[in-house]
C-alpha cells in the first residue's frame, strides 16, 4: 500500500489507476477507517450522507473534502479500463495536525542552587498524533533522572476534537557555584515524522546562591559552665547571620517556655537549673540551627571545677 | 443555543406552489449540512431534502425529485424549501433539521410548519 | 432503497418497566442509525446516534446496541415522561429512512 500523510482540516484527493478519465466508469473505492465497521463501498453514482466526508469524483478519484482522524486507514480502488484490463489502487492513509506553538507557563524567575526548583511547565496545545516535549539547557537536551532534572509529564485529549494537550513540567537541581543565567527551552517534536519541532521562546532564570550557615556560637559565662550555688550563669547565642534570626533556648531536649532573646541569665542558681543546654536559631530562609550543648553544673564547697552529669530541674532563667 | 424556526407554511391548492424557510441560529451554519423531513398528520417521519454545508449539492427522494428545491443563504443562516406541483400526499407537517451526512445525523430540529394541500 | 423495519408498531407498559424497540435494516448501514423521540404535537428530540451513543441530555437509562443490521433502543426503567413515539432512523445511504415509529403507551 502506499503511504499517504494527510493535515487534519486538508482536502486529500487518491487517484484510482486504471479508471477512465471520465463517465462511464466501472470502478469502486473501499474504505476500512475509524469511520466504518469493515469495509464502506463507494460508487461513482454513490452520492449520499457519506458525500461530507468521502466521494468519487467525475474522474475516478475519491476526493475527501477535509480530512479528519477518523478517515486514518486503508482506501482501496478497482478499476476496470475499456479493454477490461483491471487495476487495482491501494493508500494507507495517516493524518496529523500540528498544534500551536508551545509556551512555557508558571516560570520561576529565580532558582535556589542546591535543592530542588519548579523551572516551568511546557504546554503544546493541539497535535495529533501526540507527539512529545523536551526541555534543554543552554541549548542542549536535559535528560530526565539525570543531574537533579526530573520531568513530569500529563498527555490529555480533547473529547470533541480528538486532538492532544502535552504538558511537561521540569524540577532541576542547580549546582552551587554554575551558571547564574541558565537558559531553558522547550520543543514539541511531531509524531508522524519529516515535520521540524517546534521551539518556545527560552527562559533565563536567576540562580542564587545560598550563603552557607556558619555555626551557632554558645557562650557560657563562667568558661565552662561551673558555679556555686547561688551564682549566676550567662549563655550568649551568637548568630553572625542577617538578618538576626530569633533564638530560643532548650534545656535537656526541651524548648524553655521563654520569648525569643540571644542571652539567657541563670541567677541564683540552684540544683534545678542544673542541665544541658543549647540555643536554637531560626532563619526565615533557612528554618532551625541548633548549637552545641553546654552543661550547667553547682560546685559544692571544697569541689573544683564542674561536676559530671547533671540534675534535672524545673527553674527557668532570666532573660536580658 | 441551536435554535431552528420554520414558516411559510399554509394552505395551497393542488398544483400550486409554497416557500418553507427556516431561520437558524446559536451555531456556525455553514459548517452544517440541513435538511427537510415531513410527517403527515398522524403518520411516520419521511425525509424530504438535504443539502451540503457550501450549497453545491442537494440530495431528495423520488418521491419529491424535480418538484421540490432545497437551496441555503449561508450569508442569512437560511435555508429553503421550494415546492411546486403539490399534490393532497404533501400535506404535513415540515420539519427543518441540522445534519443529514453521516457524521450527525440529525441533531436538532425545528418546531415545524404546517403545510396543507387542498382544493 | 433500504428498509428499516421497526417493531412492535405499540406496546403497553408501565412505569419502572424495561422497555426494548427494535429496527432491522433490509442491508448493512453500518453505525449510522439515529433513534428518536416524539411526542404528540412536538419535534422529534434525537436521543442516540451512531447506533450506541447517547446524545447530549438525554437520560442515562435509554441506551442503544446493534448486532449486525439490528438495532436495538432500551429504556432500562419507562419513567412517565417517556409514554411517546419513538422513531429509527438510517443516515448511512440514500433516501434516508425511518423507522414506521413505536408508540409507548402506559398499560
Known amino acids: 500500500a502506499q503511504n499517504i500523510t494527510a493535515r487534519i482540516g486538508e482536502p486529500l484527493v487518491l487517484k484510482c489507476k486504471g479508471a477512465p478519465k471520465k463517465p462511464p466508469q466501472r470502478l469502486e473505492w473501499k474504505l476500512n477507517t475509524g469511520r466504518t465497521e469493515a469495509w464502506k463501498v463507494l460508487s461513482p453514482q454513490g452520492g449520499g450522507p457519506w458525500d461530507s466526508v468521502a466521494r468519487v469524483l467525475p474522474n475516478g478519484s475519491l476526493f475527501l473534502p477535509a480530512v479528519g482522524i477518523q478517515d486514518e486507514g486503508i482506501f482501496r480502488c478497482q478499476a476496470m479500463n475499456r479493454n477490461g484490463k483491471e487495476t487495482k489502487s491501494n493508500y494507507r492513509v495517516r493524518v496529523y495536525q500540528i498544534p500551536g506553538k508551545p509556551e512555557i507557563v508558571d516560570s520561576a524567575s529565580e532558582l535556589t542552587a542546591g535543592v530542588p526548583n519548579k523551572v516551568g511547565t511546557c504546554v503544546s496545545e493541539g497535535s495529533y498524533p501526540a507527539g512529545t516535549l523536551s526541555w534543554h539547557l543552554d541549548g542542549k537536551p536535559l535528560v530526565p533522572n539525570e543531574k537533579g532534572v526530573s520531568v513530569k509529564e500529563q498527555t490529555r485529549r480533547h473529547p470533541e476534537t480528538g486532538l492532544f494537550t502535552l504538558q511537561s513540567e521540569l524540577m532541576v537541581t542547580p549546582a552551587r557555584g554554575g551558571d547564574p543565567r541558565p537558559t531553558f527551552s522547550c520543543s514539541f517534536s511531531p509524531g508522524l515524522p519529516r515535520h521540524r519541532a517546534l521551539r518556545t521562546a527560552p527562559i533565563q532564570p536567576r540562580v542564587w546562591e545560598p550563603v552557607p550557615l556558619e555555626e551557632v556560637q554558645l557562650v557560657v559565662e563562667p568558661e565552662g559552665g561551673a558555679v556555686a550555688p547561688g551564682g549566676t550563669v550567662t549563655l550568649t547565642c551568637e548568630v553572625p547571620a542577617q538578618p538576626s534570626p530569633q533564638i530560643h533556648w532548650m534545656k535537656d531536649g526541651v524548648p524553655l517556655p521563654l520569648p525569643p532573646s540571644p542571652v539567657l541569665i541563670l541567677p541564683e542558681i540552684g540544683p534545678q537549673d542544673q542541665g544541658t543546654y543549647s540555643c536554637v536559631a531560626t532563619h526565615s530562609s533557612h528554618g532551625p540551627q541548633e548549637s552545641r550543648a553546654v552543661s550547667i553544673s553547682i560546685i559544692e564547697p571544697g569541689e573544683e571545677g564542674p561536676t559530671a552529669g547533671s540534675v534535672g530541674g524545673s527553674g527557668l532563667g532570666t532573660l536580658a | 443555543e441551536v435554535q431552528l424556526v420554520e414558516s411559510g407554511g399554509g394552505l395551497v391548492q393542488p398544483g400550486g406552489s409554497l416557500r418553507l424557510s427556516c431561520a437558524a441560529s446559536g451555531f456556525t451554519f455553514n459548517n452544517y449540512w440541513m435538511t427537510w423531513v415531513r410527517q403527515a398528520p398522524g403518520k411516520g417521519l419521511e425525509w424530504v431534502a438535504s443539502?451540503?454545508?457550501?450549497?453545491?449539492?442537494?440530495y431528495y427522494p423520488d418521491s419529491v425529485k424535480d418538484r421540490f428545491t432545497i437551496s441555503r443563504d449561508n450569508a442569512k443562516n437560511s435555508l429553503y424549501l421550494q415546492m411546486n406541483s403539490l399534490r393532497a400526499e404533501d400535506t404535513a407537517v415540515y420539519y427543518c433539521?441540522?445534519?443529514?451526512?453521516?457524521?450527525?445525523?440529525?441533531?436538532?430540529w425545528g418546531q415545524g410548519t404546517l403545510v396543507t394541500v387542498s382544493s | 432503497d433500504i428498509q428499516m423495519t421497526q417493531s412492535p408498531s405499540s406496546l403497553s407498559a408501565s412505569v419502572g418497566d424495561r422497555v426494548t424497540i427494535t429496527c432491522r435494516a433490509s442491508q448493512d448501514v453500518g453505525i449510522y442509525v439515529n433513534w428518536f423521540q416524539q411526542k404528540p404535537g412536538k419535534a422529534p428530540r434525537r436521543l442516540i446516534y451512531?447506533?450506541?451513543n447517547l446524545a447530549d441530555g438525554v437520560p442515562s437509562r435509554f441506551s442503544g446496541s446493534r448486532s449486525g443490521t439490528d438495532f436495538t433502543l432500551t429504556i432500562s426503567s419507562l419513567q412517565p415522561e417517556d409514554f411517546a413515539t419513538y422513531y429509527c432512523?438510517?443516515?448511512?445511504?440514500?433516501?434516508?429512512?425511518f423507522g414506521g415509529g413505536t408508540k409507548v403507551e402506559i398499560k
Open positions: 433539521a441540522r445534519g443529514g451526512d453521516i457524521t450527525t445525523g440529525f441533531d436538532y
Open positions: 443539502i451540503d454545508n457550501s450549497g453545491d449539492n442537494t
Open positions: 432512523l438510517q443516515y448511512d445511504a440514500h433516501p434516508l429512512t
Open positions: 451512531r447506533a450506541t
